[in-house]
């Protein structure tokens, strides 16, 4: 007989996934020598066991601990980049100015980026069919709880100046909804973190207003404000100058506004 | 290069004991776990047991369970298998393999050595 199997709007687990988030521990603990001492099986022990058997509705930031504590990590809380609705861009500025950290150059973020897992209630099976999706079945699934959980942790421990790159092209430039809205915002600690600079990155080539003056950003400066820590913010006119004059601060062309 | 070298193999009575070793060079060692995989006459590979980068975790097939134990020495680079109560039909080539892990008894290998053989016979 044919178990019963609940569909979910969103995609399935991504294809290899136990594979993958091993071969991605295995590749992270060899580039980064500070994180020899993981235990990449045990890693992947405790990934699944977040969500294995558990209903995909039903995951507590609880369920991640034990993968929390495996992937303890230190970055200098001074060098923390955020960003929202703009990661390509933000990945591509971190590699470039390696002494700076999205939450994807983390262990756990680089585990668990681009990719989408599930389980099923009382069996051992992943769900490679279908995974809940945030808005139209439920908010508490493995994917969304899991970045909720490092997000949370990631903004926690920043300090002094904190970046953020927001995405100039979109109708919310600042989004409370996002997770830079909606968790790491609010756990800014402000008796560490002394100024929230924003960088607004435009697309058109021809875009020469201030998106500072944007009325998100005014509200996400509010917000920020009443939280004790200062805000400022910067328009980059031109990201793929921005990026070459991140690798070539020597190019003359670099000491004009970007 | 990856190089994985094993040894230990021989001929071995029933119920007798063996130690394989593995010397393994050209990675990052303790950032991958380790394996022994099995090939007896005339049938296919065989999973036999695995230990992670640290050696805080190890996994065995069934049939090997309670007999062989699977060590790892982070400072030589060397995983070992102690066989223990032998039986014919351990008789197999046994390859020491390098690989990401595994998820239940699925092993995602990497590379593997050469081989050598062990006889169990009387």
């Known amino acids: 007989v044919p178990r019963w199997r609940q569909q979910w709007s969103g995609p399935g687990t991504t294809k290899r996934f136990p594979e993958t988030v091993l071969a991605r521990c295995v590749k992270y603990t060899e580039i980064h020598p500070e994180m020899r001492h993981v235990d990449c099986q045990s890693v992947w022990d405790a990934f699944k066991g977040a969500f294995i058997s558990k209903h995909p509705c039903n995951i507590t930031e609880e369920d991640y601990q034990p993968l929390m504590k495996l992937g303890t990590q230190t970055v200098p809380c001074n060098k923390i980049l955020l960003w929202s609705r703009i990661k390509d861009l933000a990945h591509q500025f971190t590699q470039v100015q390696r002494d700076m950290f999205t939450l994807e150059d983390t262990l756990l973020g680089y585990l668990a980026d681009d990719l989408t897992w599930c389980g099923e209630f009382n069996t051992s099976k992943i769900n490679y069919q279908s995974c809940p999706d945030w808005r139209k079945d439920c908010s508490n699934n493995p994917v969304s709880v899991f970045w909720k959980t490092v997000s949370r942790r990631f903004a926690e421990a920043a300090c002094d100046v904190v970046h953020v790159m927001l995405n100039g092209s979109r109708s919310k430039i600042f989004d409370k909804n996002s997770t830079f809205g909606s968790v790491e915002v609010h756990n800014l600690q402000p008796e560490k973190v002394q100024t929230l600079e924003a960088w607004v990155i435009h697309g058109g080539r021809e875009d020469s207003r201030d998106l500072c003056q944007d009325p998100t950003i005014k509200e996400l400066e509010s917000i920020i404000s009443k939280r004790n820590i200062q805000f400022s913010c910067k328009n980059i006119y031109r990201p793929d100058k921005f990026l070459q004059c991140v690798k070539n601060p020597e190019d003359s062309s670099c000491t004009s506004e970007i | 290069e990856v190089q994985l070298l094993e040894s230990g193999g021989g001929l071995v009575q029933p119920g007798g004991s063996l130690r394989l070793s593995c010397a393994a060079s050209?990675?990052?060692?303790?950032?991958?776990?380790m394996s022994w995989v099995r090939q007896a006459p005339g049938k296919g590979l065989e999973w036999v047991s695995a230990i992670s980068g640290s050696g805080g975790s190890t996994n065995y097939v069934d049939s090997v369970k309670g007999r062989f134990i699977i060590s790892r020495d982070n400072s030589k680079n060397t995983p070992d298998l102690q066989m223990n109560s032998l039986r014919a039909d351990d008789t197999a080539v046994y390859y020491c393999a390098s690989g990401k892990g595994w998820d239940g008894n699925t092993w995602y290998e990497d590379y593997r050595g050469q081989g050598t053989l062990v006889t169990v016979s009387s």
């Open positions: 050209g990675f990052t060692f303790s950032s991958y776990a």
